[in-house]
Interface confidence: low
């Protein structure tokens, strides 16, 4: 008996073989099948040659099918949609010869580390390409050259450290570009060309505000209505533009579009003068002082294991007056979670005054697996004198563009209605073993460092602030089962946490990278500020104020 459901909807024969425990293609598929669902089956490997008789096949869904290998060795002349997301593919074969009609390719949440230059050759009808949540560090410069009709490109939550110049050349139809949650520090001059790009997502990258960022800063100013903060399950066109979501990681966390680079040399190449001459703009930078933003720590016995594809973690960027903690909007911390998520980014060491080292060089050779430090970690004991900000240190004023207590995910989902698979990430990326930070002298006394010379930084306080990252606040007791949720303002993807204004006495749970577990975006409760304002979890007595 044929175990799959056959239906005819919108004039097409649709066969649903999802979650049937299939290890191979079932016999008896209708020859005029147009839509074939094979998701959530332990297929392991798949060859399109098996589908040769299905000459009318228009959609093939292989999501979460434990695929380690995809062979595109059989011609499927009418296939328009191929979904191989949430699998274990380490590479993609060349697709164009066998799938000439492909319009949508979803290879999100695989283990792709690189793409060959010819992967998309022949896919002249491709409209949507989803590569979110892989491990891509670089991209072939001409990867998209064959896909002139591309409309949506999702490269979010990879490990991209750079973008090739001319990468978007010829993509006149492109309307949505997801680049959030990568390791990008700048974009090449002219990268966006004259594309309109109505929907662009650039937040959650360690944008380095120096002279090289001026092109992006100007582009953001010119396209401020086209830059969005991505929200789980919300279509791009339904969200509100938020150009402030793109922030400098090294310069007081200000929005990139406000960065003027007054000390930068004028552009020498005359061709770009009119676009990149920033000296003709006299507007003053907005003040960089902001009210303290409350970080809410709540407790729950909910210890269900989540898989995460959320953003990266940058516990510190080593500026004495402004530790930059890049935390996704909501973190769950639990002893049970000892692995970094696969998208975990580089951790800039506190001993480096300038985070100029490319993140890719910061990968460990071993993986931390236990939350217990083997040596006494640097701690901020609640019994010690609270570290208070120096009066000469102006608090930052990053006005939240939306209600700050609403957590916002930082990655888009190509499949917002379906839960993510519970696969365990396998390649954590901390720079050093995060559970055993070494104190400079004694564990209880954070040691200052010298102030790096950075023109943009204000005069440092007379008493230098400790450079110990907030990720090493150690407990006096180890948590056993409760989950701690730290909810941070959406308005600041990169959070500057120079010091605690009062010690956290209510919770002594650690924020230790080996314990950090980032829940799937769709699993986060989407409470509005109104509905959560009076919620017990937002009680100010629960935690500390963190000046941002």
């Amino acid at each position: 008996e044929f175990i799959c459901e056959v239906s005819k909807v919108t004039s097409q024969v649709e066969v649903n073989c999802d979650n049937k425990g299939l290890k191979a293609l079932p016999p008896g598929l209708p020859g005029d099948t147009a839509i074939l669902h094979l998701a959530e089956n332990p297929l392991g490997a798949f060859s399109t040659a098996l589908l040769g008789p299905l000459t009318r096949l228009a959609q093939l869904h292989l999501r979460q099918s434990q695929l380690t290998q995809l062979q595109v060795d059989g011609m499927l002349p009418r296939l328009e949609t191929l979904d191989v997301s949430h699998n274990r593919l380490k590479s993609l074969p060349s697709l164009g010869r066998a799938l000439p009609a492909l319009t949508t390719l979803d290879a999100s949440f695989n283990e792709l580390v690189a793409l060959s230059p010819g992967t998309l050759d022949g896919l002249s009808h491709l409209h949507e390409l989803y590569l979110r949540g892989n491990k891509l560090k670089t991209l072939p410069p001409r990867l998209l050259a064959p896909t002139a009709q591309l409309r949506k490109l999702n490269l979010a939550d990879n490990r991209l450290t750079e973008l090739p110049p001319g990468f978007l050349e010829g993509l006149g139809e492109l309307d949505t570009l997801y680049l959030q949650g990568n390791w990008l520090r700048t974009v090449p001059k002219g990268f966006f060309g004259d594309l309109l790009l109505p929907f662009t997502f650039l937040h959650g990258n360690p944008w380095s505000c120096d002279c090289e960022i001026l092109y992006l800063a100007r582009w953001l100013r010119d396209n401020s209505n086209n830059v969005y903060l991505w929200k789980e399950g919300v279509e791009a066109k339904a969200t509100t533009p938020n150009v402030d979501s793109v922030r400098c990681v090294n310069w007081k966390n200000v929005p990139v579009h406000t960065y003027q680079g007054k000390d930068c040399p004028s552009p020498m190449d005359g061709g770009d003068m009119d676009y990149d001459n920033y000296d003709d703009e006299d507007e003053k930078l907005p003040g960089v002082e902001a009210p303290a933003t409350r970080a809410v720590v709540s407790f729950s016995t909910h210890t269900k294991a989540h898989t995460t594809h959320w953003g990266l973690l940058y516990p510190t960027f080593a500026y004495p007056d402004h530790q930059m903690a890049y935390l996704s909007s909501t973190l769950e911390l639990t002893e049970k979670q000892t692995m970094f998520p696969s998208t975990l980014g580089p951790i800039m060491p506190t001993t480096t005054p300038e985070p100029t080292t490319p993140p890719t060089t910061l990968e460990p050779t071993t993986t931390p697996t236990t939350p217990e430090p083997t040596t006494p970690p640097t701690t901020l004991e609640p019994t010690t004198t609270p570290i208070t900000p120096e009066p000469t240190m102006p608090p930052t004023t990053l006005e939240p563009t939306t209600t700050p207590i609403t957590p916002e995910p930082t990655t888009p989902s190509t499949t917002p209605t379906t839960p993510q698979p519970a696969t365990t990430p396998t390649t954590p990326q901390p720079a050093t073993t995060p559970t055993t930070p070494q104190p400079a002298t004694t564990p209880t006394t954070p040691q200052p460092t010298t102030t790096p010379t950075i023109p943009e930084l204000p005069t440092p306080p007379t008493t230098p602030e400790p450079t110990m990252p907030p990720t090493t606040l150690e407990p006096t007791t180890t948590p056993t089962s409760p989950t701690t949720t730290l909810i941070l303002s959406e308005s600041n993807t990169f959070l500057g946490i120079p010091e605690l204004t009062s010690p956290c006495t209510t919770s002594e749970y650690p924020i230790v990278p080996s314990l950090v577990h980032l829940p799937e975006a769709h699993e986060v409760a989407r409470g509005t500020s109104d509905s959560s304002r009076n919620h017990r979890l937002f009680n100010p007595d629960l935690c500390c104020l963190l000046p941002l």
């Epitope: 005819k8 004039s11 024969v13 209708p30």
Partner: antibody
Amino acid sequence: QVQLVESGGGLVKPGGSLRLSCAASGFTFSSFAMSWIRQAPGKGLEWVSSITSAGTPYYPDSVLGRFTISRDNAKNSLYLQMNSLRAEDTAVYYCARSRGYEDYFDYWGQGTLVTVSS
Amino acid sequence: DIQMTQSPSSLSASVGDRVTITCKSSQSLLNSRNQKNYLAWYQQKPGKAPKLLIYFTSTRESGVPSRFSGSGSGTDFTLTISSLQPEDFATYYCQQHYSSPWTFGQGTKVEIK
């Protein structure tokens, strides 16, 4: 050229049965979905049944459980087995070829009349 | 089921006239995935089988004269004969091929004035 020729119509009493046939030629029969559409005297068109190239049948509620569509690709033939016939089944029955899986009908036979009357 | 309603049920026209027949569906026939409207038009002459004229709202079947055109989207559709010819006097049916069961309009009879 594409040709569809229906046969098997006639007069039958209510509750009786009839089997219609459609002989197809001029195209690769096995590659196409096929359908039966009927037209009561002086009335409009009503879809009766379809069968995909792989043999999956489809029916409207009005004939479900009474009519059975089948095909024999080796004989290039389409069939409609009609049981428990009612007076309202009286109509000219057309055999038609469905275009792809889009279910509009690009070629029709000349029709065969089925009369259900006591 | 999707109901199809044609209007008028009959009309009289002369050779050379521009004739418009409308068809309304009880729900949208637009497939948002490919932006196509799943509506077809047929012509039937007395004693003959129907003949396909147009599918996907506006795509003419091969061999169909260009004076026949279709338009519309969602739930409202139109068949237009730009210049009526003697051989065009017949009954015209719309059919939705969006969702099973496939349903037809009741027909519009175009007669000689």
